[in-house]
């Protein structure tokens, strides 16, 4: 006669907190004589799931009539599945005997896996921004997830990224994973208005992966580039001094203005022009009188961006040789 | 052919452990329960307990619970059985017994050859 | 525990006889006995399962008989090798009890 055989056609099964789950095992034979029992795991400690005979099973009904004489289908089904119930299950033919059963052959096991989605990414950037050409990380977490299968990719402005790490955790068996993935993104210039995506994948979400983002302006200072003009006045003892800050990110700037050395003005930055690619431009005048000047005047424009160091630039004003000579006059 | 080898006699002292093995071979190990039996000189036959060599699951008989431990080694199809806190009326041949797979009643068709343990200070 | 009486303890006998060996249990066992030979310095030998199943490769000669708490082992025409010591074995209950023995020897 044919050897029995212990058939449980899933290796696999993912379930969601709450649903039901149903087991598969069928047999090929009627023989030995003896019950079918149902076990989550192996070894001594193995847990009974199922007993038709004897013990009050409340969330497990049979799929057949166990009762009928020629049933092979010794399925079950678990309801109001909770995280707990994750494991191995295994149908189990014993040989009657007394004083007890005799275990005679095991199924290969189907292995209930937590069907849970993973929750939002959440997109985080670095400490403290950087300057163009920089390398910054950005790192996207996930977590909740089962089974740990699961894909996360990395997009700059919708280009796919490649240089990142990535790793789930536990590594081993859980009711639930979460993803950890670091990206190194190197910063232009027009980065301000750039955006960073993570993207995550996973069976439980039908193919819709899950998105989050992290603008690169958080992660950006574009210092200003400096530029002094001077222009005389029509009246012809006064220079406009125009002092342009331009292409700077974030708007936070303050200006201060020295004469030879001497504090003259300080201003914050306000009334911004903004550029397309999100950098701000200011411009700041300084009017000079020159009438009452006998030397060279060194006129210097300090500018302080984000809470970097200052960043100073000057210019000469050179005062005639007709006015350094009233000049000389006026003090003999 | 099925035989079940046990190991070598030992002697200990009064408060010791012995640990007896059985290697199987012939037939599939996980496939037949394992049960010890021993036998005290001129004297009749007393069970100890059994294991499942598939689960690791064991039945000891109340008299030995907690004084024996029997485990198993499936890569070497091998059965162990430790009994601790000697005394000297635990001096017996110790049987390892295969669980015959017609029976109903739980009957042994296969021995090992037996394992002298004498007990002595 | 169940425990088992054998009777008689021993007996003698001589070659080609009739030997009827019993077995009483303390409760009934249904026909959960078995009975196994022993010879001297040799582990066990099973004979009968069932109460009344002869075991692959054991003679003919040898039958076990009854149900509930009396069984018989009977060997219908004694043959030297069978002089040995013969043990009923309940298998109802746990623990699982041997009954003392019954030694068979030539008259």
């Known amino acids: 006669e044919e050897e029995l055989q212990m058939i449980q056609p899933e290796k696999l099964l993912l379930v969601a907190v709450g649903e039901s789950a149903t087991l598969n095992c069928t047999v090929t034979s009627l023989l030995p004589v003896g019950p079918v029992l149902w076990f989550r795991g192996v070894g001594p400690g193995r847990e009974l799931i199922y007993n038709q005979k004897e013990g009050h099973f409340p969330r497990v009904t049979t799929v057949s009539d166990l009762t009928k004489r020629n049933n092979m289908d010794f399925s079950i089904r678990i309801s109001s599945i909770t995280p707990a119930d994750a494991g191995t299950y295994y149908c189990v033919k014993f040989r009657k005997g007394s004083p007890e059963n005799v275990e005679f052959k095991s199924g290969p096991g189907t292995e209930m896996a937590l069907r849970a989605k993973p929750s939002a990414p959440v997109v985080s950037g670095p400490a403290a921004r950087a300057t163009p050409e920089h390398t910054v990380s950005f790192t996207c977490k996930s977590h909740g997830f089962s089974p740990r299968d699961i894909t996360l990719k990395w997009f700059k402005n919708g280009n796919e990224l490649s240089d990142f790490q990535t790793n789930v955790d536990p590594a081993g068996q859980s009711v639930s994973y979460s993803i950890r993935s670091t990206a190194r993104v190197v910063l232009a210039p027009w980065d301000v208005r750039s955006q960073v995506t993570c993207e995550v994948a996973h069976v439980t979400l039908q193919g819709d992966p899950l998105r989050g983002t992290a603008n690169l302006s958080e992660a950006i200072r574009v210092p200003p580039t400096l530029e002094v003009t001077q222009q005389p006045m029509r009246a012809g003892n006064q220079v406009n001094i125009t002092y342009q800050v331009r292409n700077f990110y974030p708007q936070n700037l303050q200006l201060t203005w020295l004469e030879n050395g001497n504090v003259c003005r300080t201003e914050t930055a306000s009334t911004l022009t903004e550029n397309k690619d999100g950098t701000y431009n200011w411009t700041s005048w300084l009017l000079v009188n020159t009438s009452d000047q006998r030397d060279d005047v060194v006129l210097t424009c300090q500018v302080k961006h984000d809470g970097q160091l200052a960043v100073n630039k000057s210019l000469v004003l050179e005062v005639s040789a007709h006015q350094k000579d009233q000049s000389s006059d006026a003090t003999h | 052919q099925v035989q079940l080898v046990q190991s070598g006699a030992e002697v200990k002292k009064p408060g010791a452990s012995v640990k007896v093995s059985c290697k199987a071979s012939g037939y599939t190990f996980t496939r037949n329960y394992v049960h010890w039996v021993r036998q005290a000189p001129g004297q009749g036959l007393e069970w100890m307990g059994r294991i499942n060599p598939n689960s690791g699951g064991t039945n000891t008989a109340q008299k030995f619970q907690g004084r024996v431990t029997m485990t198993r080694d499936t890569s070497t199809s091998t059965v162990y059985m430790e009994l601790s806190s000697l005394r000297s009326e635990d001096t017996a041949v110790y049987y390892c017994?295969?669980?015959?797979?017609?029976?109903?009643?739980?009957?042994?068709?296969?021995w090992g050859q037996g394992t002298l343990v004498t007990v002595s200070s | 525990d169940i425990q088992m009486t054998q009777s008689p303890s021993s007996l003698s006998a001589s070659v080609g006889d009739r030997v009827t060996i019993t077995c009483r249990a303390s409760?009934?066992?249904?026909?959960?006995l078995n009975w196994y030979q022993q010879k001297p310095g040799k582990a066990p030998k099973l004979l009968i399962y069932d109460a009344s199943s002869l075991e692959s490769g054991v003679p003919s000669r040898f039958s076990g008989s009854g149900s509930g708490t009396d069984f018989t082992l009977t060997i219908s025409s004694l043959q030297p090798e069978d002089f040995a010591t013969y043990y009923c074995?309940?298998?109802?209950?746990?623990?699982?009890?041997f009954g003392p023995g019954t030694k068979v020897d030539i008259k």
């Open positions: 074995q309940q298998a109802n209950s746990f623990p699982l009890t």
């Open positions: 409760q009934s066992i249904s026909s959960y």
């Open positions: 017994a295969r669980l015959g797979d017609v029976a109903v009643a739980a009957s042994f068709d296969y």
